[in-house]
Amino acid sequence: EDELQVIQPEKSVSVAAGESATLRCAMTSLIPVGPIMWFRGAGAGRELIYNQKEGHFPRVTTVSELTKRNNLDFSISISNITPADAGTYYCVKFRKGSPDDVEFKSGAGTELSVRAKPS
């Protein structure tokens, strides 16, 4: 059986300030069981943008219904983009663990750049 891959098809996305940004992510397998998370940045200080399990993410919506059986699409949309949202976003698969889930595989990242709002 092939190991799960995390696919972020766009290396970069450019969005005008005030618009929504769609960041695409797909898995190639339902296994292993465990949540996905989106982060900005890849280092120790990375910021949590979305957690499938829990949390407060008022500007983030999922493009598809994540709880739907056999769903492999974990794309998100971030509303009301500002220049402060620029950065590289990573879709990361975790493997269910006890007591904590364990990071399993990360996508290659999508760089979000923000254009000035059209006048």
Partner: antibody, heavy 117, light 108 residues
Framework: DVQLVESGGGVVRPGESLRLSCAAS????????MTWVRQAPGKGPEWVSL???????YYADSVKGRFTISRDNSKSTLYLQMNSLRAEDTAVYYC???????????WGLGTLVTVSS | EIVLTQSPGTLSLSPGERATLSCRAS??????LAWYQQKPGQAPRLLIY???SRASGIPDRFSGSGSGTDFTLTISSLQSEDSAVYYC??????????FGGGTKVEIK
Amino acid sequence: DVQLVESGGGVVRPGESLRLSCAASGFTFSNFAMTWVRQAPGKGPEWVSLVSVTATTYYADSVKGRFTISRDNSKSTLYLQMNSLRAEDTAVYYCAKITWNNLFDYWGLGTLVTVSS
Amino acid sequence: EIVLTQSPGTLSLSPGERATLSCRASQTVGSKLAWYQQKPGQAPRLLIYDSSSRASGIPDRFSGSGSGTDFTLTISSLQSEDSAVYYCQQHNDWPPYTFGGGTKVEIK
């Protein structure tokens, strides 16, 4: 407005323990890595420890095995348990919020830890 | 561990003059260098990151440059409120995050 308020500092003897707390408000605490930075009198800042959003912990070599960083997202509070304290641990201890690109963008006012016999 | 060396230790200048502060890294940090300002009794305040990007709310008289191992913070026209100690810090992706020893800027 982002606010970070440290507490728990004081005067202790070498070998004793102390637990620092940092109460955070004005941002979604669970979404950001947090760190402790200390500054000895008349010296520059020294990074001490970091806890990531997934609770992975990192330590400076000078405190590894003696200090433990932790977070309670339900209370928006960061902690630093300091054991086997030494005179060279004497410093103002700041907690700071970390940005996605590893910058310390907000700092507390600090709490003074003095280790003296 | 990356060691950051700042020079000079102290800079004494008159209001309106240009201040040039240096930070040298013991190994390359790319552009991942930040500058902080610290006034007595206060916590450090982020000024510059990624070598040359100004943090939110920082006046444009502060500018940064450099890459690799050699970096410069320039204050184009000193004002009395710029009297402080300035620290550089490398902000690569992984700890330890190191700071320089600082440069004290005094206004005559």
